[in-house]
């Protein structure tokens, strides 16, 4: 069941999904200039079997302008260095041995995608919160939000996170800071991935997220 | 008690446009998104997109992508729906519903009729 | 896109007749909602989460089911009951109701 609503927004912190309930939907959105493809798919869905849980279409972006050709999903080898791929490989190899039952990781990119990524989750998923740099957490609780549905409405639960400013940079017990810009990252403030103009953050963010969780979650 | 009211009928031409207007009051606007459903005339309920008031954000039924255009002014608590280069097919009653999960209050509906 | 299909699309019953409405989606999905509409007048909710009344609606409607094959049961017809029932899946976009199923005087 889609949840009808938005993780919950938290003063100088950013939110990430470590892994897709089944179910998830993530749109194919492609940016300036291009377009999804006339045969595509609107949305990838997380969708699984008992022992594998796995992404259902895949999106693709031509130009605008170009009548009948397709881009193809996989990034060609100029694109990896923009895209940071190496960089956000090596730092997904510790999630990457992880894999929750039901669940779906993290999509690859594809060519021409959009800046930002857009998901709608479903009821039973749990997004994490983190400070962005220059901020520190003050914990009273899990830094992290549940979707749950009472009565047929959905809600997530409140992160008892509370990002203060200070001078040192944030760190998570055992995470090294990411690689954020100066002036951080803007809030999130639909369900999406960090809402970022630069992919190469956002990748860079996420997948360092995404091995912390998966370091402490698991403990 | 949370009410959703509708702006009146209307008649449109072919080609035209026209903006359906839905108020909400009893509840907090941004807290629910705002779910638009149509229904031609004899047929059945089609649900063609949410706007998210306090964010903007809109989601829309592919068939409904570049007909429908939602938006939404949170100093009125009002929700609004832009249909363009009406058709015959286009004449229906127009719905808003509260979101948040399953549509547990709707606006009276709204018919527009396009006719030459 | 997850097609609903309702059966049957008319029923024709008698006050104090159970009536039973079935509704089968394409795909499989977590619960099923329905809907009552009167003629002129907006749906209203009456079941969701498959099996949950909504608030002021008789016990004599029920709601069962899952994966894709769901049913709305009213136990014994009541006059105010004759009227059109609409299932309605959000378990993907986009959302899709059945085409309905008309109660109507036999």
């Known amino acids: 069941e889609l949840c009808d609503d938005d993780p919950p927004k938290i003063t100088h912190a950013t939110f990430k999904a470590v892994a897709y309930k089944e179910g998830t939907m993530l749109n194919c959105e492609c940016k300036r200039g291009f377009r999804r493809i006339k045969s595509g798919s609107p949305y990838m869905l997380c969708t699984g079997n008992s022992s594998h849980s796995s992404w259902d279409n895949q999106c693709q972006c031509t130009s605008s302008a170009a009548r009948n050709t397709t881009k193809q999903v996989t990034p060609q080898p100029e694109e990896q260095k923009e895209r940071k791929t190496t960089e956000m490989q090596s730092q997904m190899q510790l999630a990457d041995q992880v894999s929750l039952p039901g669940h779906c990781r993290e999509p690859p990119p594809w060519e021409n995608e959009a800046t930002e990524r857009i998901y709608h989750f479903v009821v039973g998923q749990t997004v994490y919160y983190q400070c962005v740099q220059g901020y520190r957490a003050l914990h009273r609780g899990p830094a992290e939000s549940v979707c749950k549905m009472t009565h047929g409405k959905t809600r997530w639960t409140q992160p008892q996170l509370i990002c203060t400013g200070e001078t040192e940079p944030s760190q998570f017990p055992g995470e090294e800071e990411p690689q954020a810009s100066p002036d951080g990252l803007p809030e999130s403030e639909t369900s999406r991935l960090v809402t970022t103009t630069d992919f190469r953050i956002q990748t860079e963010v996420a997948a360092t997220m995404e091995t912390f969780i998966f370091t402490t979650e698991y403990q | 008690q949370v009410q959703l009211v509708q702006s009146g009928a209307e008649v449109k031409k072919p080609g035209s446009s026209v903006k359906v207007s839905c108020k909400a009051s009893g509840y907090t606007f941004t807290s629910y998104r705002m779910h638009w459903v149509r229904q031609a005339p004899g047929q059945g309920l089609e649900w063609m997109g949410y706007?998210?008031?306090?964010?903007?954000?809109?989601e829309y039924n592919q068939k409904f992508k570049d007909k429908a255009t939602i938006t939404a002014d949170e100093s009125t608590n009002t929700a609004y729906m832009e249909l363009s280069s009406l058709r015959s097919e286009d004449t229906a009653v127009y719905y808003c519903a509260r979101g948040g999960g399953v549509f547990d209050y709707w606006g009276q509906g709204t018919l527009v009729t396009v006719s030459s | 896109d997850i097609q609903m299909t309702q059966s049957p699309s008319t029923l024709s019953a008698s006050v104090g007749d159970r009536v039973t409405i079935t509704c089968s989606a394409s795909s499989s999905i977590s619960y099923m909602h329905w809907y009552q509409q009167k003629p002129g007048k907006a749906p209203k909710l009456l079941i969701y989460?498959?099996?949950e009344l909504a608030s002021g609606v008789p016990a004599r409607f029920s709601g069962s089911g899952s994966g894709t094959e769901f049913t709305l049961t009213i136990s014994s017809l009541q006059p105010d009951d004759f009227a059109t029932y609409y299932c309605h899946q959000r378990s993907t976009y986009p959302l899709t109701f059945g085409q309905g199923t008309k109660v109507e005087v036999k």
């Open positions: 989460t498959t099996s």
């Open positions: 706007i998210n008031p306090s964010s903007g954000y809109t």
